[in-house]
Interface confidence: medium
């Protein structure tokens, strides 16, 4: 079972007031960059595990959660540095000896390939070229994702030039 | 001006102990994992031990394990080593070197010491 | 713990020279591999990391290449401030965080 992640869709057709108002647009936060869907920030300071999970939470955002093979890629392209490393949302579950990623679904076998080993206090993150697992209580960087947000812009025809 | 700082060597009998200190300067310390790395007289490089940025997660060279004690006060941009028990063979340079970013899992050292000499004789 | 063999351990060459050196783990560190130039009396310094990427203020003649178990350190044309020791290190999740014996590159 994949992580899910919820899609936006956007009604250029909505009603209009007096004022006319732009389509609707999709914004990331100030500091935080949109891929596709999703707003990710990429943290400065190193945390452990837990205290990025809290991070997140604070920012109403959460952890990574990686999709697909796709996903993963496109955000190791924006890790500009190989010596850096990234927490992510998904840790080792020792009651169910699975990876478990933070919405409670399992990682699916064809999703990441991790480099290290699946145990307890076992957490993973991502460098440029890699997914690996370490001890959770490493401090490293770390990735919150949120989804896009519902920005609606009203202003006068003529701005639109 | 970037730059890390050590002093506390010198000349030290056998079994005694001896407290190395490296203060650092221009950087943000806090966020940065640190290392201590020796070098005895005409020989290679030897990671002794590094500590992660809070002070939570510590690691030592079996060479050194029970014997040195790594500790760190961010408050005062200070690294230090409690070296007890000393042997002949700790007789080294002793550099103190930050991590390259602040990542904790490959530590590439970016920024080091002139170091600090510990000689170790009766 | 991870080894590495660093060869040669010396090396004798000119200014405009091609220098190879080559570093080799006992076991596989994917690319988590630096290499530093040390003058005498001096601090290493960081000119590789990642085996291959450049560090920050290091000149383009230093290169590096590898993954697994088999590195090099390339200086594509020896200038008169190289003459120097190098060494690899290892930076693998789990320490120690072993380095090379080093290589020694002197004026031929």
């Known amino acids: 079972q994949k992580p899910s992640i919820g899609k936006c869709s956007v009604d250029i057709q909505q009603n209009r007031t007096k004022t006319t108002e732009r389509p609707d647009l999709l914004n990331c936060p100030i500091y935080w960059q949109q891929v596709q869907e999703k707003c990710l920030l990429f943290s400065h300071t190193v945390n452990p595990w837990n205290n990025s999970l809290a991070d997140c939470s604070t920012k109403e955002s959460s952890l990574l959660l990686i999709q697909d093979k796709d996903e993963l890629t496109r955000t190791q392209n924006l890790i500009h540095d190989k010596a850096i490393s990234f927490w992510i949302g998904l840790n080792f579950s020792l009651s169910e000896k699975n990876w478990k990623w933070i919405n409670g679904s399992f990682l699916s076998s064809n999703d990441l390939k991790i480099t290290g080993d699946a145990k307890e206090n076992s957490c993973v993150y991502i460098s440029q070229t890699s997914v690996y697992s370490e001890y959770c209580s490493t401090e490293m960087k770390w990735i919150c994702q949120k989804e896009l947000t519902l920005v609606r812009n009203k202003v006068s025809p003529d701005s639109w030039l | 001006q970037v730059q890390l700082v050590e002093s506390g060597g010198g000349l030290v009998k056998p079994g005694g102990s001896l407290r190395l200190s490296c203060a650092a300067s221009g950087f943000t310390f806090p966020q940065y994992y640190m290392s201590w790395i020796r070098q005895a007289p005409g020989k290679g490089l030897e990671w002794v031990s590094y500590?992660?940025?809070?002070?939570?997660?510590?690691y030592y060279a079996d060479s050194v394990k029970g014997r040195f004690t790594i500790s760190r006060d961010n408050a005062k941009n200070s690294l230090y080593l409690q070296m007890n028990s000393l042997r002949a063979e700790d007789t080294a340079v002793y550099y103190c070197?930050?991590?390259?970013?602040?990542?904790?899992?490959?530590?590439?050292?970016?920024?080091w010491g002139r170091g600090t000499l510990v000689t170790v004789s009766s | 713990d991870i080894q590495l063999t660093q060869s040669p351990s010396s090396v004798s060459a000119s200014v405009g020279d091609r220098v190879t050196i080559t570093c080799r783990a006992s076991q596989g560190i994917s690319s988590w591999l630096a290499w530093y130039q040390q003058k005498p009396g001096k601090a290493p310094k960081l000119l590789i990391y990642?085996?291959?990427s450049l560090q920050s203020g290091v000149p383009s003649r230093f290169s590096g290449s590898g993954s697994g178990t088999d590195f090099t350190l390339t200086i594509s044309s020896l200038q008169p401030e190289d003459f120097a020791t190098y060494y690899c290190q290892q930076v693998t999740s789990t320490p120690p965080y072993t380095f090379g014996g080093g290589t020694k590159v002197e004026i031929k």
């Open positions: 500590i992660s940025p809070s002070g939570a997660t510590i």
């Open positions: 990642a085996a291959s």
């Open positions: 070197a930050r991590s390259l970013m602040s990542t904790g899992t490959h530590l590439y050292f970016d920024l």
